[in-house]
Interface confidence: low
């Protein structure tokens, strides 16, 4: 907390300009009017304030706007945005794409910070849905931003926006997020032919159900192991050895190297050892010969 002290004679700021960089922290507190700062925020970014001085300026804005800054101030925060906490940002109501772009520019080249994640969260909630313009803007700054959104937030993405998503945008998505995105992608790409469809849908397959994987296995898609390893375990488990062999095509040999990793390891444990042996890969851990294989999904439905 900066101590309240009277502004020295002749030091009262008439405007936000370079002379303020020579002010001590207590002088900034005493001599800069918060309302003046708010109306001239666009100048702050052009002045080489120290981080300590920026702390004082932030403190003044916090006092002026205890309920959260107006968008007119937010749009011109510049480097002061880096001083904001997620708690500060949760008080904002950001609706302009230009405001969002201005703040993302400040953080450009860095990892997505908690502040940026919160900002995007506030923006999407304000907009009501993640439209294509927003999606294009955000993917330009953060390839992985989609995966920072909750499944609930992703549900607001219209299928038409899926065309803006690139494979690298989905790298860090978890299965719950892909569960939401996959049906949208399926809808978006439904009119494409087989091979083109697979190229587009491939990145989203971590959300695909068993029946869709079975269908793909009949289309000679030759799924690579990297894609297979990202599939939902529960979707892979019901696939037969023959179906996995068709799905992977020449990549089936890669199962050996991944036999201890999900979903391969869990799939192996649910297959008959006799069936696994037909692959000739030396996969071990299948159900011993003579053991009854229960259909677990049927068992659960009956219980």
């Amino acid at each position: 907390e900066v101590e309240k002290t009277a502004c020295p004679s002749g030091k009262k700021a008439r405007e936000i300009d370079e002379s303020l960089i020579f002010y001590k922290k207590w002088e900034l507190e005493a001599c800069v009017d918060a309302a003046l700062l708010a109306t001239q925020m666009d100048r702050v970014n052009a002045i080489p304030f120290t981080y300590e001085q920026l702390d004082v300026l932030k403190h003044k804005l916090d006092e002026l706007y205890p309920q959260g800054y107006p968008e007119s101030v937010i749009q011109h925060l510049g480097y002061l945005f880096l001083k904001m906490s997620p708690e500060d940002i949760r008080k904002w109501n950001v609706t302009s794409l230009e405001t969002l772009k201005a703040l993302l520019e400040v953080n450009k080249g860095h990892e997505m910070s908690p502040q940026v994640a919160t900002l995007i969260d506030r923006f999407v909630k304000g907009r009501g849905q993640l439209d294509k313009d927003t999606l294009d803007t955000l993917t330009a700054f953060y390839p992985g931003y989609l995966c920072s959104l909750s499944p609930e937030e992703l549900s607001s993405v219209p299928p038409s926006s899926i065309w803006a998503v690139r494979p690298q945008d989905l790298d860090t998505c978890d299965p719950r997020q892909l569960d939401v995105l996959y049906p949208k992608a399926r809808l978006a790409f439904q009119n494409m032919n087989g091979s083109e469809y697979f190229v587009k849908i491939q990145s989203f397959l971590g959300g695909a159900p068993t029946e869709d994987l079975k269908a793909l296995s009949q289309q000679n898609v030759s799924m690579d192991l990297a894609t297979f390893m990202k599939l939902r375990t529960d979707a892979v488990l019901p696939l037969t050895v023959a179906e996995v062999q068709k799905l992977l095509g020449p990549h089936v040999e890669g199962l050996k190297a991944e036999e201890r990793h999900r979903p391969v390891r869990d799939w192996i444990l649910r297959q008959r050892q006799d069936d696994l042996d037909t692959l000739g890969l030396g996969l071990q851990g299948g159900i011993p010969n003579g053991y009854l294989v229960l259909d677990l999904s049927m068992q659960e439905a009956l219980s």
Partner: antibody, heavy 117, light 110 residues
Framework: EVHLVESGGGLAQPGGSLRLSCAAS????????MAWVRQAPGKGLEWVAN????????YYVDSVKGRFTISRDNAKNSLSLQMNSLRAEDTAVYYC??????????WGQGTLVTVSS | QSALTQPPSASGSPGQSVTISCTGT?????????VSWYQQHPGKAPKLIIY???RRPSGVPDRFSGSKSANTASLTVSGLQAVDEADYYC??????????FGGGTKLTVL
Amino acid sequence: EVHLVESGGGLAQPGGSLRLSCAASGFSFSSSWMAWVRQAPGKGLEWVANIKQDGSSQYYVDSVKGRFTISRDNAKNSLSLQMNSLRAEDTAVYYCARDIWYSIDYWGQGTLVTVSS
Amino acid sequence: QSALTQPPSASGSPGQSVTISCTGTSSDIGGYNSVSWYQQHPGKAPKLIIYGVSRRPSGVPDRFSGSKSANTASLTVSGLQAVDEADYYCSSYGGSNNLLFGGGTKLTVL
């Protein structure tokens, strides 16, 4: 004949470190998953960690994550367990073992680690 | 507290059969067929006697057999002999590359 010989056990202070080593022979070490299993005095067995054939993946029981590191040198047929920030509850006989699909088929004779001040 | 539950002790007379149970959940024993059993004599390292629920490694007598029903695995030792007196541990794959062990059962040959 298969041999797994552990070394490096002994007395350590709480918060201290120890490095266990295991020399393997008599089987194809480089094509085997390897593991460390421990047994506290008078208690049951507890899996500690395992490591993939080429060393690219390692897995740990929750209680040692961030403190223990399993590693291997296939050129020397050796397995190691670096134990940092040791606690009294880490006191146990540590067995070097071969992990065949979540079964331990080969065991060493074990090395005793005592954590006490 | 062990992840898999075994009775602390079991006993039988020479020539008899004894069964040791190992209870888990649908996430370990019930979910996979990677149950193993180990025999450990005092002061010795454990020895694998059953893997893959019911498979015996070479050299293990056929007096030892394994089975599984739902979330419980069982080890049966028939034709009990004095040399069978030892601690027995079950293990199961528990998901996420974890190997879970039972607390152990002390088998006494009366």
